[in-house]
C-alpha cells in the first residue's frame, strides 16, 4: 500500500443526488446462507474527501474511543494514530483502555514516500455502523509517521482488509477481518460501495457528506443494479485478480495480456487512481488522447499533474472514451467486462474549483508494481470481496456518477481462451514487499 503515489481516495455524497440512480433489475442472484439482502445499519457508513480516503467509524478500547479509520483493501494492518500529530484531531490513548494488551513488539512500515512506525498490541474493537459484535484485534499504535496522515482528511488510522501474507512485520500478525470472522458468526465476506462525488465538494459539504457503504458479512441488494459478476482471487495476499483484455471505447489495446497483470493486478480501495503498468499506461493514454482528440490537453494533464478546468456544468464528458477491463470469469474460458466512464477517471479537485469552474485531474497513472484498481474503478461498482469463495464480485453501483448518455456497466459472458496465461508469476525470492 503506497501513500504518496498511493494516496487514499475520494468520496462524496451517496445516493440519488449524485446523478441518476438506475432502476433495480429484478433478476437477482439466489440468496446464499448467512447473506441477508439488506444491511440497513451499515448502509452509508463511509465518509471521505476527494483524493483523501473513505473512512468508517470504529471504536477501540474500554471505555470505547471513537476514531475514523481509512478502509484499505490494499494492506493488512489495523494501525491507528497513538500519539499527538499536527494532522490528527484525536488519537488512540492506550493508557486509558483497561483492555489494552501490549505485544512488546514494534512494527516499521516504509512506503515509497513516507512511513509509519509503532508498537503492536491488542484491544477490543467494534464498528458502530457495522455488525453488532466486539472483537479482540491486533492494533499497531502509530507513534511516529512521515507523509502518512493527511491534513484535513478526517481519518486517524487505517483498516487493512487484505490477507495475512502482506501484514507487517510478518504474516503471523492476524489481520482484523480474520479476527472478526474467527471470533464471531460474521460470514467471511464484505462488500464496498464507494460513491464518488462527480463534482467538487467544499469543506462544509464534505463534513456533512456520505461517501458510501462497507457491508460487513454480506451483500446489500439496494446498493447495485443488474447482476453481480465474479472473478477469482488469484492468490490470497493482496486482492489479486487477472485482467485478460483492455478496451478504450470498444477498441482493443491488443497487448499481450500478461502486460496487464505485470507484476500483479489488485483491487485496492486505498488507492485513488487506476494505476497501470508502464507499457499499458502509455498505450492507454495514446488511445484516450486519440479518442478525445477534438480537444487537446497539456502533457502535464496526462501525467496527472495539471488540472483541466471547464466553465461550471460544461465538462465535455462525451469527448472522453469509456474504458473496459475484461476480468477472468469463474467458468473456464469465460470472462466479463467492467466499463468505467470519464466521470470515474477524471477526478474532481475541490481546492481549485470555483463557482465558475469545474476542475479535474486525470486519475489514471503509471505504476511499477502492476495494475491497481483503485477508487477510479471501484466508484463505478459495488464490489464484493467474497473471501469465503475466493472471488471478487462486481455489479454496477447504484450511486455511480454518469450522464444521460452512458453508464458504467458490468457485462458478460465473453469467450476468452488461455486466460491462465495472462497471470504473471512473480519470481520467488527473499525480497521484502515493504517498498510496495
Amino acid at each position: 500500500t503506497q501513500h504518496g503515489i498511493r494516496l487514499p481516495l475520494r468520496s462524496g455524497l451517496g445516493g440519488a443526488p449524485l446523478g441518476l440512480r438506475l432502476p433495480r433489475e429484478t433478476d437477482e442472484e439466489p440468496e446464499e446462507p448467512g447473506r441477508r439482502g439488506s444491511f440497513v445499519e451499515m448502509v452509508d457508513n463511509l465518509r471521505g474527501k476527494s483524493g483523501q480516503g473513505y473512512y468508517v467509524e470504529m471504536t477501540v478500547g474500554s471505555p470505547p474511543q471513537t476514531l475514523n479509520i481509512l478502509v484499505d483493501t490494499g494492506s493488512s494492518n489495523f494501525a491507528v494514530g497513538a500519539a499527538p500529530h499536527p494532522f490528527l484531531h484525536r488519537y488512540y490513548q492506550r493508557q486509558l483502555s483497561s483492555t489494552y494488551r501490549d505485544l512488546r513488539k514494534g512494527v516499521y512500515v516504509p512506503y515509497t514516500q513516507g512511513k509509519w512506525e509503532g508498537e503492536l498490541g491488542t484491544d477490543l474493537v467494534s464498528i458502530p455502523h457495522g455488525p453488532n459484535v466486539t472483537v479482540r484485534a491486533n492494533i499497531a499504535a502509530i507513534t511516529e509517521s512521515d507523509k502518512f496522515f493527511i491534513n484535513g482528511s478526517n481519518w486517524e488510522g487505517i483498516l487493512g482488509l487484505a490477507y495475512a501474507e502482506i501484514a507487517r512485520p510478518d504474516d503471523s500478525l492476524e489481520p482484523f477481518f480474520d479476527s472478526l470472522v474467527k471470533q464471531t458468526h460474521v460470514p467471511n465476506l464484505f462488500s464496498l460501495q464507494l460513491c464518488g462525488a462527480g463534482f467538487p465538494l467544499n469543506q462544509s459539504e464534505v463534513l456533512a457528506s456520505v461517501g458510501g457503504s462497507m457491508i460487513i458479512g454480506g451483500i446489500d441488494h439496494s446498493l447495485y443494479t443488474g447482476s453481480l459478476w465474479y472473478t477469482p482471487i488469484r492468490r490470497e495476499w493482496y486482492y489479486e485478480v487477472i485482467i485478460v483484455r483492455v478496451e478504450i471505447n470498444g477498441q482493443d489495446l491488443k497487448m499481450d495480456c500478461k502486460e496487464y497483470n505485470y507484476d500483479k493486478s489488485i483491487v485496492d480501495s486505498g488507492t485513488t487512481n487506476l494505476r497501470l503498468p508502464k507499457k499499458v499506461f502509455e498505450a492507454a493514454v495514446k488511445s484516450i488522447k486519440a479518442a478525445s482528440s477534438t480537444e487537446k490537453f497539456p502533457d502535464g494533464f496526462w501525467l496527472g499533474e495539471q488540472l483541466v478546468c471547464w466553465q461550471a456544468g460544461t465538462t465535455p464528458w462525451n469527448i472522453f472514451p469509456v474504458i473496459s477491463l475484461y476480468l477472468m470469469g469463474e467458468v473456464t474460458n469465460q470472462s466479463f467486462r467492467i466499463t468505467i466512464l470519464p466521470q470515474q477517471y477524471l477526478r474532481p479537485v475541490e481546492d481549485v474549483a470555483t463557482s465558475q469552474d469545474d476542475c479535474y485531474k486525470f486519475a489514471i497513472s503509471q505504476s511499477s508494481t502492476g495494475t491497481v484498481m483503485g477508487a477510479v474503478i471501484m466508484e463505478g461498482f459495488y464490489v464484493v470481496f467474497d473471501r469465503a469463495r475466493k472471488r471478487i464480485g462486481f455489479a454496477v453501483s447504484a450511486c455511480h456518477v454518469h450522464d444521460e448518455f452512458r453508464t458504467a456497466a458490468v457485462e458478460g459472458p465473453f469467450v476468452t481462451l488461455d486466460m491462465e496465461d495472462c497471470g504473471y508469476n512473480i519470481p520467488q525470492t527473499d525480497e521484502s514487499t515493504l517498498m510496495t
Epitope: S293, T294, E295, K296, F297, P298, D299, G300, F301, E305, Q306, L307, V308, C309, D351, V352, D357, C359
Partner: antibody, heavy 120, light 108 residues
C-alpha cells in the same frame, strides 16, 4: 525562426466588433505541439488572457469574455484571428498573440502587440 | 480560481544589486509557475518556467525557486537592461489564464 505578427484596425467604435489577425511566419500553425492564444494589456495595467485555439479548431476562452469572443484559425494562410463583439472603452488595450506549448504550457513566444483603442 | 499575488509592487534598486521578487499563489500550483519580463513598449518575454528552469537564451543571473504556493525570482546582479516589469503566471490549471499583478523593478 518562428515569428508572430498582429494586424488589424487600431481604432474601433463602441458597440462594434474588434477584429485582429495573427500571422505565423517561419513555422507551421498546424504543429501538434502548440495552441495559439490572445492576451491583452490595458494601458498601465496587467496581462489578461483572452483565449486560445488549436489548429484543429479546438478553443478555450476566458469565461469573463466568453460571450463576446470568437477565435478562429485558417491553416491555409497560417493565421488565427480574434473577434471581440460589443466593445466598450474598457476593451482598449494592447492585444498580443502568443504561442502556448502543450509540453511546457507557457506563452513561450509573443507577437509585438497592437494597440486597439475603443472610442467614438 | 487561483489568485497570484506579487510583491513588492515596486522594487527600487541600483545596477549590480540583487533583486528578489515574490509570487504567492492562493493554493498550491505545484511547480507549474513561470516568470515573464516586460520592458516598456515591448511584449512580455518568458524568463523562467516550471518554477526554476531558464527559458532559451535567458542569462544565468536570472533564477527561479519555490514550489507549492511560494515562489521567488532572483536577479543576482542587476544589469541596466533588467529594469522592467516582471509577471508570474501559473499553469497548474489549464487553460493557462492566471497572471500575477506584476512587480516593477526601477532604478533607484
Amino acid at each position: 525562426q518562428l515569428q508572430l505578427q498582429e494586424s488589424g484596425p487600431g481604432l474601433v467604435k463602441p458597440s462594434e466588433t474588434l477584429s485582429l489577425t495573427c500571422t505565423v511566419s517561419g513555422g507551421s500553425i498546424s504543429s501538434s505541439s502548440y495552441y495559439w492564444g490572445w492576451i491583452r494589456q490595458p494601458p498601465g495595467k496587467g496581462l489578461e488572457w483572452i483565449g486560445m485555439i488549436y489548429y484543429s479548431g479546438s478553443t478555450w476562452y476566458n469565461p469573463s469574455l466568453k460571450s463576446r469572443v470568437t477565435i478562429s484559425v485558417d491553416t491555409s494562410k497560417n493565421q488565427f484571428s480574434l473577434k471581440l463583439s460589443s466593445v466598450t472603452a474598457a476593451d482598449t488595450a494592447v492585444y498580443y498573440c502568443a504561442r502556448v506549448g502543450l509540453g511546457v504550457s507557457y506563452f513561450d513566444l509573443w507577437g509585438r502587440g497592437t494597440l486597439v483603442t475603443v472610442s467614438s | 480560481e487561483i489568485v497570484l499575488t506579487q510583491s513588492p509592487a515596486t522594487l527600487s534598486l541600483s545596477p549590480g544589486e540583487r533583486a528578489t521578487l515574490s509570487c504567492r499563489a492562493s493554493q498550491s500550483v505545484s511547480s507549474y509557475l513561470a516568470w515573464y519580463q516586460q520592458k516598456p513598449g515591448q511584449a512580455p518575454r518568458l524568463l523562467i518556467y516550471d518554477a526554476s528552469k531558464r527559458a532559451t537564451g535567458i542569462p544565468a543571473r536570472f533564477s527561479g525557486s519555490g514550489s507549492g504556493t511560494d515562489f521567488t525570482l532572483t536577479i543576482s546582479s542587476l544589469e541596466p537592461e533588467d529594469f522592467a516589469v516582471y509577471y508570474c503566471q501559473q499553469v497548474y490549471t489549464w487553460p493557462p489564464r492566471t497572471f500575477g499583478g506584476g512587480t516593477k523593478v526601477e532604478i533607484k
